[in-house]
């Protein structure tokens, strides 16, 4: 499966999109920022296969995409903005699943690296747990949609692992 | 290697116009807002304004607003200060410097060298 | 705007000297400040974000702490290259702010 080239293409799709999302200036949300930690010295100090990298690209993306089909996340963005974002992301994750089965075959279950699943899933609890605590604000959202592109550029690993051969 | 890389000294007339340059290199210029300070000879740092280069979205000391336009070229990643007329006050060390946004990461990280603009009749 | 408010403006010491300068907040600015050194004909440099991250390649013997309106910086033990101006900066909101900023001199 072609999966870098196509990959790279819907990323920066969803990644323009996330940008065209915005709906007040970020300049107001300053005193909001938060530290989120995205696990990005464990990813870095990584060389990913690809089926880990696959593995652990497809939660990245999954939990963003749980993370925006929320009611919340609905009534804090421009609906057809949001659809064709939530889109871009149910394709990638098409991608990404159909890539699984080719690289290790129907009946086998890629080598789910745990360790980096656990910290991928306690990374997006801390945004939703932070989102709760801020009542999902606009500017809540607005800090959250600036992280999720920040983590979105940060795997850069990854991506690099999805170039190997197994 | 992240620069910023500012545009050469000017010695300017009052009355002139003037736009000084900030180019980024070595990251993600659209993930970075860009700031500006001054600071006048012996004096202290002033703030002035803010650019997201991303949709050129800008804010402004009350100090400096109306005095000064801050721009933004993505395509060739690149901050502008600029000055439609200028004043003999307006002397002084330009400096550029990235921030990281909504991000939580160190502010004003990298700063350009400055650019020095002195307007004298 | 946030008024920053620097102390003491000026202060000599000598080289191995444990010094101290203060910031303080016209109002609560949580953990957004900054700390920058700057050398004469240099650009500022970043010492200290978050009011008490130290910046990549800074030596260890900068630090800063507090939160709401009262900030310090800590130099531990002075050394030559240390003497340069300080200043201090919110970035709580905007417009953002500086302190006044504080010279270090040689005694």
């Known amino acids: 499966c072609d999966l870098p080239q196509t990959h790279s293409l819907r990323n920066r799709r969803a990644l323009i999109l996330l940008a065209q999302m915005g709906r007040i200036s970020p300049f107001s949300c300053l005193k909001d920022r938060h530290e989120f930690r995205f696990p990005e010295e464990e990813f870095d100090g990584h060389q990913f296969q690809k089926t880990q990298a696959i593995s652990v690209l497809h939660e990245m993306i999954q939990q963003t995409f749980n993370l925006f089909s929320t009611e919340d996340s609905s009534a804090a963005w421009e609906q057809s903005l949001l659809e064709k974002f939530s889109t871009e992301l149910y394709q990638q994750l098409n991608d990404l699943e159909a890539c699984v089965i080719q690289e290790v075959g129907v009946e086998e279950t890629p080598l789910m690296n745990e360790d980096f699943i656990l910290a991928v899933r306690k990374y997006f609890q801390r945004i939703t747990l932070y989102l709760m605590e801020k009542k999902y604000s606009p500017c809540a959202w607005e800090v959250v949609r600036a992280e999720i592109m920040r983590s979105f550029s940060f795997s850069t690993n990854l991506k690099k692992g999805l170039r190997r051969k197994d | 290697e992240v620069q910023l890389v500012q545009s050469g000294a000017e010695v300017k007339k009052p009355g002139e116009s003037l736009k000084i340059s900030c180019k980024g290199s070595?990251?993600?210029?659209?993930?970075?807002?860009i700031g500006w300070v001054r600071q006048m000879p012996g004096k202290g740092l002033e703030w002035m304004g803010i650019i997201d280069p991303s949709d050129s979205d800008t804010a402004y000391s009350p100090s400096f607003q109306g005095q000064v336009t801050i721009s933004a070229d993505k395509s060739i990643s690149t901050a502008y200060l600029q000055w439609s007329s200028l004043k003999a006050s307006d002397t002084a060390m330009y400096y550029c410097?990235?921030?990281?946004?909504?991000?939580?990461?160190?502010?004003?990280?990298?700063w350009g060298q400055g650019t020095l603009v002195t307007v004298s009749s | 705007d946030i008024q920053m408010t620097q102390s003491p403006s000026s202060l000599s010491a000598s080289v191995g000297d444990r010094v101290t300068i203060t910031c303080r907040a016209s109002q609560s600015i949580s953990k957004f400040l900054n700390w920058y050194q700057q050398k004469p004909g240099k650009a500022p440099k970043l010492l200290i974000y978050f009011a008490s991250s130290l910046q990549s390649g800074v030596p260890s013997r900068f630090s800063g702490s507090g939160s709401g309106t009262d900030f310090t910086l800590t130099i531990s033990s002075l050394q030559p290259e240390d003497f340069a101006t300080y200043y201090c900066q919110q970035s709580n909101t905007l417009p953002f702010t500086f302190g006044q900023g504080t010279k270090v001199e040689i005694k």
């Open positions: 070595g990251y993600s210029f659209t993930s970075y807002w």
């Open positions: 410097a990235r921030h990281p946004g909504l991000n939580w990461a160190p502010d004003f990280d990298y």
